[in-house]
């Protein structure tokens, strides 16, 4: 399950690149997809252009079931995964043959989810079960997001929170660190 | 912060009819199911039933089927229950809660926010 | 509907000793999550999906289990782990609790 269907299909994004204003309520949950397990920090670039155009962010479709235990949708849903590269558009390998990649150096720039949608999805269980409704969130577009050394230390900038974020694996999080710096951290590293 | 907050302790009489608030802060309840649960004291935790607030699509508990209405308004981001023809078995607090939603290489579910709980006593 | 039994109902445990409480479904689930609850205040998401702790659950916490057996477990008590906490399933229709461990510090 995941990844049947992988359709990559690449929209670029243009970013803001001033300061970020509050994510709107209703997108406080879930705001990376994937676990910043890796541990690893995301790449530099060089660039200290203003100009927002110079930057561009990859949007690539994906196409998967959702699940319970031994229940399967009907239909698969279409999300976007934002890949995990932001840099100039020009630079930006988004086509064969286009440009090539940058030396890491200067401020972080992350493809980040930045819209939600909320769908609702009819879940088909083995055994003559009853289907099953359950409401996924997923990822309607992306964004290039300039993150500071200040937003890597995430203590202080407030992305959105969630009351109860779950953590896979065992390692704790730290009493004395907040969920919205738990937030951070998973945006720097998506 | 995301919260759920919910309205104040009910003191009603036997056979009346009692409508309890959730209100959500910091989330849009249409992206949500929000579910009830009621806990009497010193007791475990029964589920009630759930809503669809952006078209009320609802599913209750077989036992609460007739006892408890769930109703949601987008407008004022609130949810509510009602529970009507009132015992002392209804004497509990009752709980609002957001179904949950991850996704990394599997889907799940849980209940990550739930509201402050309001108290029901019913006598006369 | 699929009942939810958990053991023992009420346990206490000193600190820095293991704990272990199970629950026991009358038929196969898929997962089972767990809910911490102290005195008055809201159960909060200890554990969701058999083995995945919530943020902020220290490491000391770990669930696991599958079929109609599921537990959890502290590997060393501490006094603010004194809660009850409950067991949840929603394999099958409709969404039920366990009744609770009540776990005290001795």
């Known amino acids: 399950q995941g990844w049947q269907a992988f359709k990559n299909d690449a929209t670029e994004i243009i970013p803001e690149l001033g300061e970020y204003p509050e994510p709107p309520p209703e997108l406080e949950n879930n705001k990376t997809m994937n676990r910043a397990e890796n541990g690893g920090r995301p790449p530099h670039h060089p660039f200290e252009t203003k100009d927002v155009s110079e930057y561009s962010c990859r949007e690539l479709h994906f196409t998967r079931y959702v699940t319970d235990g031994p229940c399967r949708s009907a239909k698969p849903v279409t999300e976007l995964v934002c890949s995990g590269q932001c840099g100039p558009a020009r630079l930006l390998p988004n086509a064969i043959g286009r440009g090539k990649w940058w030396r890491p150096s200067g401020p972080d720039f992350r493809c980040i989810p930045d819209r939600y949608r909320a769908q609702r999805v009819q879940l088909l269980c083995p055994g003559g079960e009853a289907p099953r409704a359950r409401k996924v969130r997923l990822v309607a577009s992306c964004k290039c997001k300039r993150l500071t050394r200040f937003h890597n230390q995430s203590e202080l900038k407030d992305f959105g929170t969630e009351a109860a974020r779950p953590q896979k694996g065992r390692k704790p999080r730290p009493r004395a660190r907040s969920a919205k710096a738990n937030q951070a951290e998973l945006e720097n590293a998506y | 912060e995301v919260q759920l907050q919910q309205s104040g302790a009910e003191h009603v009489k036997p056979g009346a009819s009692v409508k309890l608030s959730c209100t959500a802060s910091?989330?849009?309840?249409?992206?949500?199911?929000i579910h009830w649960v009621k806990q009497r004291t010193a007791q475990g935790l029964e589920w009630i039933g759930r809503?669809?607030?952006?078209?009320?699509?609802?599913e209750y508990a077989p036992r609460f089927q007739g006892k408890a209405t769930i109703i949601a308004d987008t407008s004022s981001n609130t949810a509510y229950l009602q529970l009507s023809s009132l015992t002392s078995e209804d004497t509990a607090v009752y709980y609002c809660?957001?179904?949950?939603?991850?996704?990394?290489?599997?889907?799940?579910?849980?209940?990550?926010?739930w509201g402050t709980g309001t108290t029901v006593t019913v006598s006369s | 509907e699929i009942v939810l039994t958990q053991s023992p109902a009420l346990m206490s445990a000193s600190p820095g000793e293991k704990v272990t409480m199970t629950c026991s479904a009358s038929?196969?689930?898929?997962?089972m999550h767990w809910f911490q609850q102290k005195p008055g205040t809201s159960p909060k998401l200890w554990i969701y999906?058999?083995?995945n702790l919530a943020s902020g659950v220290p490491a000391r916490f770990s669930g696991s289990g599958s079929g109609t057996s599921y537990s959890l477990t502290i590997s060393s008590m501490e006094a603010e782990d004194a809660a009850t906490y409950y067991c949840?399933?929603?394999?099958?229709?409709?969404?039920?609790f366990g009744a609770g461990t009540k776990l005290e510090l001795k």
């Open positions: 809660a957001r179904e949950g939603y991850y996704y990394d290489s599997r889907d799940y579910w849980y209940f990550d926010v």
């Open positions: 910091d989330f849009n309840i249409k992206d949500y199911y």
């Open positions: 809503i669809d607030p952006e078209d009320g699509e609802t």
């Open positions: 038929s196969s689930v898929s997962y």
């Open positions: 999906s058999t083995s």
């Open positions: 949840q399933q929603w394999s099958s229709n409709p969404l039920t």
